[in-house]
Amino acid sequence: SQPQAVPPYASENQTCRDQEKEYYEPQHRICCSRCPPGTYVSAKCSRIRDTVCATCAENSYNEHWNYLTICQLCRPCDPVMGLEEIAPCTSKRKTQCRCQPGMFCAAWALECTHCELLSDCPPGTEAELKDEVGKGNNHCVPCKAGHFQNTSSPSARCQPHTRCENQGLVEAAPGTAQSDTTCKNPLEPLPPEMSGTMLM
């Protein structure tokens, strides 16, 4: 069997054996080693010498196998843009940011660049649960049967109606999507001006 090519090696078809860890260098028409994550090219390859890599300095990173001659500068999560840090920058990974609580990503360019406040869901609705927090604005959906939500809020959840009988009371007024059931003491009539949820 043919011996495995070790960089640098000639490539006539401009492709390299290991696309992830090697790259085609057109000036010399050879395949050279890429630098692993967390490093950069300190010495470029030639026909007789392979790439030499060096570790990224503090506060800089390269995330992938690369042939970059510099490392990328770590950037903080910008609170003015509504972002907060969830993981610090390392030599192999940029700072991980997310939208602050109560915000969603309004501008996306490979990563979130700008967050905005989530819209309120009106009474009788709640925000549809998403797979990923902060990914999009609220989509308000009606409370399901037997539940209510009585505020304008981006995060309030629909709650189940109170079951009067569980408290030894009787229903004075049924719950709606926007209000809870009104309960009363079974021995007392409900005065018309009373609007409390529960009368003792």
Partner: antibody, heavy 120, light 107 residues
Framework: QVQLQESGPGLVKPSGTLSLTCAVS?????????WSWVRQPPGKGLEWIGD???????YYNPSLKSRVTVSVDKSKNQFSLKLSSVTAADTAVYYC?????????????WGQGTLVTVSS | DIQMTQSPSSLSASVGDRVNITCRAS??????LNWYQQKPGKAPKLLIY???SLQSGVPSRFSGGGSGTDFTLTISSLQPEDFATYFC?????????FGPGTKVDIK
């Protein structure tokens, strides 16, 4: 202007070890260059021995590889050559040189050379 | 290893002469060829690389050409300071190798 200066014993006994140092001035050994050793037996042609990068990466001439060690000392801005088990055939003028990385691998700066004689 | 040969091994010429030195590689080396000048008791000096780029500070009377296996160093008008030995060097594959040299002396 980069300057290179070889130093070391001019006489080495057969089967002994030849040791030379090259001091780099007018530039940093930590720059993007390879630091090389080339020798020239009296009245003959040039032979590349090997070279080193400042991180310690080395390349050696296969014909000498088993006997050669090149090392670097960044704190002193110098690099060194050790050639073991020497014979009279290793008598030569030894040059240190610089080769910029990523080029067509030419040697653009040379030391003045030092003659090393292998004799008992 | 790639073998490098040079011709002639020596030549005698006069000041003002046009001089050609040939270097041949044992296999194709594309354009990976460099030329050096060496004077007695001195280190080699880079003249030309890859194989027609003039090194900084080298007079324009020196020129180089060729590709593949055959290369030429030309001195258009020989000057007194040009009497020396000239070496070619390939850097196409490891190890880099040098030609045996061409000595240019005064006629």
């Amino acid at each position: 202007q980069v300057q290179l200066q070889e130093s070391g014993p001019g006489l080495v006994k057969p089967s002994g070890t030849l040791s030379l140092t090259c001091a780099v001035s007018g530039g940093s050994i930590s720059s993007s260059n390879w630091w090389s050793w080339v020798r020239q037996p009296p009245g003959k042609g040039l032979e590349w021995i090997g070279d080193i990068y400042h991180d310690g990466t080395t390349y050696y001439n296969p014909s000498l590889k088993s006997r050669v060690t090149v090392s670097v000392d960044k704190s002193k801005n110098q690099f060194s050559l050790k050639l073991s088990s020497v014979t009279a055939a290793d008598t030569a003028v030894y040059y240190c040189a610089r080769s910029p990385s990523g080029t067509t691998d030419y040697f653009d700066y040379w030391g003045q050379g030092t003659l090393v004689t292998v004799s008992s | 290893d790639i073998q490098m040969t040079q011709s002639p091994s020596s030549l005698s010429a006069s000041v003002g002469d046009r001089v050609n030195i040939t270097c041949r590689a044992s296999q194709s080396i594309s354009s990976y060829l460099n030329w050096y000048q060496q004077k007695p008791g001195k280190a080699p000096k880079l003249l030309i690389y890859a194989p027609s780029s003039l090194q900084s500070g080298v007079p324009s009377r020196f020129s180089g050409g060729g590709s593949g296996t055959d290369f030429t160093l030309t001195i258009s008008s020989l000057q007194p300071e040009d009497f020396a030995t000239y070496f070619c060097q390939q850097s196409y594959s490891t190890p880099p190798t040098f030609g045996p040299g061409t000595k240019v002396d005064i006629k």
